[in-house]
């Protein structure tokens, strides 16, 4: 049907066409008749038509010259059908702060040029969404950028120069979000070889959850075509696609402090994201800042989180200290960082699920360690869990309702810390409650910023 002659060239074309349609259009080769050259069925023809329609070719159902040319064009390794958004409403990153790490560098370019190309590629997407991207150099990033050739640790080996240039996995844990670039290509900053910036913009689109577009003007079109990178812009289709997943940049303004300027410390409405003791100091976290209060001293200093811990994100959501171990745990979204002796430990962040939280827990609101019981309390929405730091497992019988066991507190809290051997200080919005855990009741109601002499 697609070809009626059986020269070796045409046989090769059919085999190549089959493989292409299998990889990119879901053709199930094992369902084709054994006599490959004389298809009685329409499977192959239907898939050729599907491909021609998607890529804007004349729909003939034949492996004609323009179809074969398109099949040989350099392209992304992600399939065109079974569109990448495998699941309704997903997969997407369920957070706006996303980290990336460049695992290794192509020898084709200067390191600085690679860094710049990747940074600018992420910027293309952050310009039209509320997403913020941050490069980290150690630990586990959401998106790992890899240059590799041939078999490289997933099932989808690269194919040498030309053909597949790169591929990326949609959002998720582990390999999720990772972008792999074929080292057998010649990566460049210009129109020669394969332009890294343009390819990275496309692959990052996949890393964020986008599928391929059938609009030839879209960066998410499957095949590679150089355009002037100085005048490069996303197409309307690209923008529509990414904003359907994450919204537009204005979505950021729902945050109380959109420009992340330093919050006014004595603002009566001030609330905190997280609070913890660190030795004889108290750290108060808010957006990208923290205030440092040395116990019993009036003076307070404000700092950028990144100035103390460059690899940590802004917007820390929970924190607790185990003073005997000189450890501080910091939480954001579904990840946590371990700080030992004020230094971030390598191989972090790790998943909060390593504490034993069920999968539906996506973030921690507040956490506090009680050294008397050697237990950590994790507050999530209107419930809390209790974790045994010695046995390193959750205590049975949890979660429990906050309101049921902490009289007068809840239903949700923003932050909490432990002090003076008997008090928890709970933060809810601009209010703070001193709670005696021995008497099991609130002993004082204060403003959140009462520690600063406001």
């Amino acid at each position: 049907l697609p070809l009626n002659s059986s020269t070796s060239l045409e046989k090769n074309n059919v085999l190549f066409g089959e493989r292409y349609l299998e990889k990119f259009y879901g053709l199930e080769i094992n369902k084709l008749p054994v006599t490959k050259m004389k298809y009685s069925g329409n499977l192959m023809k239907e898939k050729i038509q599907e491909m021609q329609h998607f890529l804007g070719l004349k729909v003939t159902g034949q492996l004609d010259t323009s179809t074969l040319e398109m099949m040989h064009a350099p392209r992304c390794g992600v399939p065109d059908v079974h569109h990448f958004r495998e699941m309704p409403g997903g997969p997407v990153w369920r957070k706006h702060y996303i980290t990336y790490r460049i695992n290794n560098y192509t020898p084709d370019m200067n390191r600085e040029d690679v860094d710049y190309a990747i940074r600018k590629a992420f910027q293309v997407w952050s310009n039209v969404t509320p997403l913020k991207f941050s490069k980290i150099n150690t630990g586990m990033a959401d998106i790992l950028v890899v240059f590799a050739r041939g078999a490289h640790g997933d099932f989808h080996a690269f194919d040498g120069k030309g053909g597949i240039l790169a591929h990326a996995f949609g959002p998720g844990s582990g390999i999720g979000g990772d972008a792999h670039f074929d080292e057998d290509e010649f990566w460049t900053t210009h129109s020669g070889g394969t332009n890294l910036f343009l390819t990275a913009v496309h692959e990052i689109g996949h890393s964020l959850g986008l599928g391929h577009s059938s609009d030839p003007k879209a960066v998410m079109f499957p095949t590679y075509k150089y355009v002037d990178i100085n005048t490069f812009r996303l197409s309307a289709d690209d923008i529509r696609g990414i904003q359907s997943l994450y919204g537009d940049p204005k979505e950021n303004q729902r945050l109380p402090n959109p420009d992340n300027s330093e919050p006014a410390l004595c603002d009566p409405n001030l609330s905190f994201d997280a609070v913890t003791t660190v030795g004889n100091k108290i750290f108060f976290f808010k957006d990208r800042f923290f205030w440092l209060k040395v116990s019993e001293r009036p003076k307070t200093s404000v700092n950028l989180i990144s100035s103390l811990w460059p690899t940590l994100p802004s917007g820390i959501e929970a924190a607790y200290e185990i003073e005997a171990r000189n450890q501080v745990f910091l939480f954001k979204d579904d990840k946590y960082w371990l700080i030992s002796n004020l230094r971030p430990e390598p191989n972090y962040p790790k998943s909060i699920h390593s504490f034993g939280f069920p999968n539906f827990v996506k973030k921690i609101d507040a956490a506090v360690f009680n050294p008397r019981f050697y237990r950590t309390y994790f507050f999530v929405d209107n419930q809390y869990w209790r974790y045994d730091e010695r046995r390193q497992m959750m205590d049975p019988g949890y979660p429990k309702l906050i309101t049921k066991n902490f009289q007068g507190i809840g239903p949700k809290i923003d932050a909490v810390f432990y002090s003076k051997n008997k008090y928890y200080y709970f933060f809810q919005g601009s209010n703070q409650f001193e709670y005696d855990f021995l008497l099991q009741r609130i002993t004082k109601t204060l403003k959140s910023n009462s520690w600063f002499g406001c």
């Epitope: 879901g26 399939p79 079974h82 989808h156 990772d178």
Partner: antibody, heavy 122, light 103 residues
Framework: EVQLLESGGGLVQPGGSLRLSCAAS????????MHWVRQAPGKGLEWVSG????????FYADSVKGRFTISRDNSKNTLYLQMNSLRAEDTAVYYC???????????????WGRGTLVTVSS | DIQMTQSPSSLSASVGDRVTITCRAN??????LNWYQQKPGKAPKLLIY???SLQSGVPSRFSGSGSGTDFTLTISSLQPEDFATYYC?????FGQGTKLEIK
């Protein structure tokens, strides 16, 4: 709750054929890649074959290439392994395993069936 | 082709011991390494994915580390239920397994 139930194992002579099935429930089958992994008696695990969610792209270990065919019927929530030209060294418990991804295979198997025993002997 | 070498092949230890199993790849596999536990007559169970992420429901005494070519699985304090065979795995390649036995 995710459940994978293999069937179709049994005793077969060298050179013979067998078709294994894996009935899936508790998740949206058509969203996920699937795999077959086997374990010969007293030996370690050996990956056999994998298939993407659409059923289009398939992958095989060199030891079974050309003899085994993996396929799936998403309308029936079932994964298959057609095994031809069976050899004594194919004797093993065959497990069906779910990948955490679909369009691409991650090779991360988060759920496994209990396995079905295939014995190739004369 | 990528190959995985797991060591030791067997290991005797006592309840409460700290145990480390290693897995080495012959080329970089980044952090794409998973660890499974298998008990006799049972299917394998996922413990650790992406080198260091703990699968939901797995006790936190299990931890994984490493990237590139060298990886380790550590059990900080062995419990009676931990005696089993452990496999590292990357895509279609499994390590040979480590049988953890009671001393």
């Amino acid at each position: 709750e995710v459940q994978l139930l293999e069937s179709g194992g049994g005793l077969v002579q060298p050179g013979g054929s067998l078709r294994l099935s894996c009935a899936a429930s508790g998740f949206t089958f058509s969203w996920y890649g699937m795999h077959w992994v086997r374990q010969a008696p007293g030996k370690g695990l050996e990956w056999v074959s994998g298939i993407v969610s659409s059923g289009g792209e398939t992958f095989y270990a060199d030891s079974v290439k050309g003899r085994f065919t993996i396929s799936r019927d998403n309308s029936k929530n079932t994964l298959y392994l057609q095994m031809n030209s069976l050899r004594a060294e194919d004797t093993a418990v065959y497990y069906c395993a779910k990948d955490i991804r679909g369009v691409f295979l991650s090779g991360l198997f988060d759920h496994w069936g209990r396995g079905t025993l295939v014995t190739v002997s004369s | 082709d990528i190959q995985m070498t797991q060591s030791p092949s067997s290991l005797s230890a006592s309840v409460g011991d700290r145990v480390t199993i290693t897995c080495r790849a012959n080329q970089s596999i980044y952090t794409y390494l998973n660890w499974y536990q298998q008990k006799p007559g049972k299917a394998p169970k996922l413990l650790i994915y992406a080198a260091s992420s703990l699968q939901s429901g797995v006790p936190s005494r299990f931890s994984g580390s490493g990237s590139g070519t060298d990886f380790t699985l550590t059990i900080s304090s062995l419990q009676p239920e931990d005696f089993a065979t452990y496999y590292c795995q990357q895509a279609g390649i499994f390590g040979q397994g480590t049988k953890l036995e009671i001393k």
